[in-house]
């Protein structure tokens, strides 16, 4: 269903357009498969406008649907490593409200050091993303080779 | 920050919309890594609005944030051909002006025949894009296996 | 070329945003390659605004320039499965009208199991787009493994 | 709902083949797929194939692959698994399943499949 005709009639800034780009701050301590992440201008080309960071996960400000795009990297890989070490798999997904949880993006590292992948998905002011690397093996921080972000693309 | 309330006001036209999709034109000499990119409606279903190419590589015509994409795949290959090739790397970056030089998104040809990922990121009016290709393979020409484009975002 | 200024004063709802992204149903019986989608809030986080299915196919509403992306990842999949059955090929294209056929997108599993991609291309009211999957592997039909979706960006 | 009833275990000798045979009944229009799990003493339930319900497509654990063969009967709305070449570690029970309902995954790879039999018993002596 279109949105009403009175809302798109307003300023843009009032429809959205929040935008997030995301560098690997560190991993979570054992037990914890989290990923944090950090943003911002002082740290080179992540930002952060209108979605936050809570504790190193990614909260969002406005509901919407929202492209949702990672690339995660293996440090020191080979594709040995990586099957030596399957199942090592990243999944991104909505862990709060709990109500709200769900796994919204799964790939799993098989003989390759590199996963990449998008998605279109409804998100809704306060859900926070979560991204779950299982196994043991480390993820770059390069900021070329992992990064994680979101895109408002419409109401 | 939010953009100046005037400057929503305005037609869309004069708040962007800059997109480009190329497909491979050739690769450089030897010691050149460069991917030289061509599009145009000619050509089949690349195209340029806003952006330019410069012997090849693509400048940006307007400041913004950009949603980078990439795909590339390996010609006449095999998962045995990509991982006795190895490392056979893409790297998108700024590579002019010099001072702006910075690598943006980079993946390996591990034991795959095709790398594909996409990144937000910042990018001014007057950065070029290239997309170095490490290695000896040579990458298909099909527009349906390789292409490179971005898209504006936001202010 | 930027579209006409009378255009652009017209209310956000003329400008499209059309968007679609779908979950998948079934694989087509033998000798069909195509992948069959399905898309809805009660199926859970899939939608169709603007863009409709037809026999499981997705059909374009707006002309326009979108960004195509999918994921597809292959059921009960290891490296050795995907290599064992080589070659496993996903392709998205326009595949009606017949006129405008065309191969848009395409990959292959080599050693891996999932294979992800976006590109950005020019569709028109009518055209319907079919994602074949070549050879005898079941694609999983978990919503965070296998999905398809478009996104309407500019005129 | 379905209805899922597991027929064709029993005792064989390492080497040896058997061929178990589900009976599927009741409304199939949502079904995407059926697969064959097993699950041996002490052990999690693991799954060993599985076969598209409106085609030929076909997938299976790395431990089975060129041993085991899935495959539909349509006429009959029978799924079977042949099993040649059995092992000691083939042993457990094997259920037959049907995969009706979307979700998204979890580590459990018998999320999905929300349709049971009630399962056959396969020995492999040694």
């Known amino acids: 269903q279109r949105f009403a005709q009175a809302q798109q009639q307003l300023p843009l800034e009032s429809l959205g357009w929040d935008v997030a780009e995301l560098q690997l701050n560190h991993t979570g301590p054992q037990q914890d498969p989290r990923l944090y992440w950090q943003g911002g201008p002082a740290l080179g080309r992540s930002f952060l406008h209108g979605p936050e960071l809570d504790k190193g996960q990614l909260r969002i400000h406005r509901d919407g649907i929202y492209m949702v795009h990672i690339q995660v990297t293996l440090a020191i890989c080979s594709s040995t490593t990586a099957s030596r070490h399957h199942p090592t798999t990243l999944a991104v997904g909505i862990c709060s409200p709990a109500s709200r949880s769900i796994s919204l993006l799964r790939l799993s590292f098989h003989q390759g050091c590199t996963i990449a992948s998008q998605r279109l998905t409804p998100l809704a002011r306060g859900d926070t993303l979560c991204t779950n690397l299982t196994g043991t093996l480390l993820p770059s921080r390069n900021t070329d080779e992992t990064f994680f972000g979101v895109q408002w693309v419409r109401p | 920050q939010r953009f100046a309330q005037a400057q929503q006001q305005l037609p869309l036209e004069s708040l962007g919309w800059d997109v480009a999709e190329l497909q491979l034109n050739h690769t450089g000499p030897q010691q050149d890594p460069r991917l030289y990119w061509q599009g145009g409606p000619a050509l089949g279903r690349s195209f340029l609005h806003g952006p330019e190419l410069d012997k090849g590589q693509l400048r940006i015509h307007r400041d913004g944030i950009y949603m980078v994409h990439i795909q590339v795949t390996l010609a006449i290959c095999s998962s045995t051909t990509a991982s006795r090739h190895h490392p056979t790397t893409l790297a998108v970056g700024i590579c002019s002006p010099a001072s702006r030089s910075i690598s943006l998104l980079r993946l390996s040809f591990h034991q795959g025949c095709t790398i594909a990922s996409q990144r937000l990121t910042p990018l001014a009016r007057g950065d070029t894009l290239c997309t170095n290709l490490t290695g000896t393979l040579l990458p298909s020409r099909n527009t349906d296996e390789t292409f490179f484009g971005v898209q504006w975002v936001r202010p | 070329q930027r579209f006409a200024q009378a255009q652009q004063q017209l209310p956000l709802e003329s400008l499209g945003w059309d968007v679609a992204e779908l979950q998948l149903n079934h694989t087509g019986p033998q000798q069909d390659p195509r992948l069959y989608w399905q898309g809805g809030p009660a199926l859970g986080r899939s939608f169709l605004h603007g863009p409709e299915l037809d026999k499981g196919q997705l059909r374009i509403h707006r002309d326009g320039i979108y960004m195509v992306h999918i994921q597809v990842t292959l059921a009960i999949c290891s490296s050795t499965t995907a290599s064992r059955h080589h070659p496993t090929t996903l392709a998205v294209g326009i595949c009606s009208p017949a006129s405008r056929s065309i191969s848009l997108l395409r990959l292959s599993f080599h050693q891996g199991c999932t294979i992800a991609s976006q590109r950005l291309t020019p569709l028109a009211r009518g055209d319907t787009l079919c994602t074949n999957l070549t050879g005898t592997l079941l694609p999983s039909r978990n919503t965070d493994e296998t999905f398809f979706g478009v996104q309407w960006v500019r005129p | 709902q379905l209805q899922l009833v597991e027929s064709g275990g029993g005792l064989v000798q390492a080497g040896g083949s058997l061929r178990l045979s589900c009976a599927v009944s009741?409304?199939?229009?949502?079904?995407?797929?059926m697969a064959w799990f097993r699950q041996a003493p002490g052990k999690e339930r693991e799954i060993v194939a599985v076969?598209?319900?409106?085609?030929?497509?076909?997938a299976y654990a790395d431990s089975v692959k060129g041993r085991f063969t899935i495959a539909k009967d349509n006429a009959k709305n029978t799924v079977s698994l042949q099993m040649n070449s059995l092992k000691p570690e083939d042993t457990g029970v094997y259920y037959c399943?049907?995969?009706?309902?979307?979700?998204?995954?979890?580590?459990?790879?018998?999320?999905?499949?929300?349709?049971w039999g009630q399962g056959t018993l396969v020995t492999v002596s040694s």
């Open positions: 399943a049907a995969d009706s309902e979307q979700s998204s995954s979890s580590e459990g790879q018998a999320y999905g499949y929300e349709d």
């Open positions: 009741g409304r199939t229009s949502s079904t995407y797929a």
């Open positions: 076969i598209g319900w409106s085609g030929g497509r076909t």
